[in-house]
Amino acid sequence: TRDVREPPALKYGIVLDAGSSHTSMFIYKWPADKENDTGIVGQHSSCDVPGGGISSYADNPSGASQSLVGCLEQALQDVPKERHAGTPLYLGATAGMRLLNLTNPEASTSVLMAVTHTLTQYPFDFRGARILSGQEEGVFGWVTANYLLENFIKYGWVGRWFRPRKGTLGAMDLGGASTQITFETTSPAEDRASEVQLHLYGQHYRVYTHSFLCYGRDQVLQRLLASALQTHGFHPCWPRGFSTQVLLGDVYQSPCTMAQRPQNFNSSARVSLSGSSDPHLCRDLVSGLFSFSSCPFSRCSFNGVFQPPVAGNFVAFSAFFYTVDFLRTSMGLPVATLQQLEAAAVNVCNQTWAQLQARVPGQRARLADYCAGAMFVQQLLSRGYGFDERAFGGVIFQKKAADTAVGWALGYMLNLTNLIPADPPGLRKGTDFS
């Protein structure tokens, strides 16, 4: 016989990312004996919850909780049985629920209560379902990206922990209902609401973050649709040859389209709307989403929101990635520079419905929205956030890092389970057995 070293015991954590358009479940794992090391937590598995986001169940809260069952059952299989009781389970809801909470707080509470009731039925260590603030969503996304890319701290070959010299990456998240920009900055923020101070591994980070509600991809598309109905009677961002019946109630039910809502309108009325493949009019329509008229600070991004100049490298994920990846992969267009990104957006917006379908087969009608999505991403980055060609060169569009989805979920779990200590590793008390 000989001694066989057992693999280290693993710990697990589960986060339900309840976004505006859908919910995703992420299961994370890490070696139990290395809890405070960096870059040690990784994604074990994930599951997409069928149907819409939990905010779409405002009239049927039990439907929201029922939708989660399939993924929770998968979690029972994915996490070893003996680890169930010790596995923290969190649900975090983002902008879809923030919007519902604005318009119908009772419904929002009912949905959270319903999902809480279901989540407590499972043998995991359920630690709450709550709505994240835009600031939290931004910061936790930034933590995730930098944790996965090991920008906070590394273990050197000489057996010491050190802080990498490369600095941190900024993070840009484009969700369904909101978009977040977060990056480390040297000077204090002129607007205190946009600044977060973090202590990670004994290092101090001053981080700028802002979340723009109603600037997520789906809400932007709804706002552009409302504008097209109002000003054109056709949709310049949709391809020529594409037309659909638009239910007015769907367009104007969101608080994001409130400003464009006609005084008297029949919510059950359907209007036929056709596309015109007009990149220039589409650009104008998208430009109307941003206001640059007033800024109470020394500098602003848009809508009077303070933002220091973008600095350093950035990772852009979620719908930023999907949009740019569509241009690059499906359409075969270069997007390495801002100029190329703009040309790619114009290219897609010039396509007729027949041309677009031939280039990208087997797709649902959502294919018609890529022009608007591309135009919005290009305008948000260049005009909105102020990326010039040089700064844009430092932006990477990424979906995963180290086989783990980039998003706020991992950062949220790391924070709530204290997997990122505030103290530097060298100061941690322990017994030296050497």
Partner: antibody
């Protein structure tokens, strides 16, 4: 009624190339696309790439990138698929399939295929 | 990369209903296509856009798609339905058509 007619069976040596043709008889490539799909003996279907002749647009599966070239001659309504650096694992039936706008550019018309055997 | 998973084989009694599944991450968000291939023949499209039949395909063939599973249903199965069935979907992330591994349908009796 459009039919696709492919060139005949081929026997090739490892390291060489093969070029298979696919002619649309009784129709043109206007508004259509052509995909190439292969099937190794006793195996499933494997998509290789596609061309939209009227747009001059091609896409290849990553697995074949750099080794496959798909072209089309609109004047003769013929598509071609050339596979280079052949190895024994490339022995398969190669199908050309028409992608039709009526079916959201899925494969509605297939030819009987061309058997390519790679053997030394 | 995106994968579609099918059972290797499915058996059905003559005249009964056969169901062949095709699973993939959030497949319900994509359109699914089904092809029938008999030995020595080219594949034939039997279902497009999840649940539509091309002309000439019997009404006995139907499809559904939601969540992570698409299903091809063949009611009142006949001996002539014995074949390999493949599901397919277009993967936007890699700009490629993806086929499932295929399911051999056997009609018993």
């Amino acid at each position: 009624q459009v039919q696709l007619v492919q060139s005949g069976a081929e026997v090739k040596k490892p390291g060489s190339s093969v070029k298979v043709s696919c002619k649309a008889s009784g129709g043109t490539f206007d508004s259509y696309a052509v995909s190439w799909v292969r099937q190794a003996p006793g195996q499933g279907l494997e998509w290789m790439g596609r061309i939209v002749p009227w747009l001059g647009f091609t896409r290849y599966a990553q697995k074949f990138q750099g080794r496959v070239t798909i072209t089309a001659d609109e004047s003769t309504s013929t598509a071609y698929m050339e596979l280079s650096s052949l190895r024994s694992e490339d022995t398969a039936v190669y199908y050309c399939a028409r992608e039709s706008p009526g079916y959201r550019y899925s494969f509605d018309v297939w030819d009987q295929g061309t058997l390519v055997t790679v053997s030394s | 990369s995106y994968e579609l998973t099918q059972p290797l084989s499915v058996s059905v009694a003559l005249g009964q209903t056969a169901r062949i599944t095709c699973s993939g991450d959030a497949i319900g968000e994509k359109y699914v296509y089904w092809y029938q291939q008999k030995p020595g023949q080219a594949p034939v499209l039997v279902i497009y856009d999840d649940n539509n039949r091309p002309s000439g395909i019997p009404e006995r063939f139907s499809g559904s798609n939601s969540g992570n599973t698409a299903t091809l249903t063949i009611s009142r199965a006949q001996a002539g339905d014995e074949a390999d069935y493949y599901c397919a979907s277009y993967d936007l992330q890699q700009a490629r058509w993806v086929f499932g591994g295929g399911t051999k349908l056997t009609v018993l009796g």
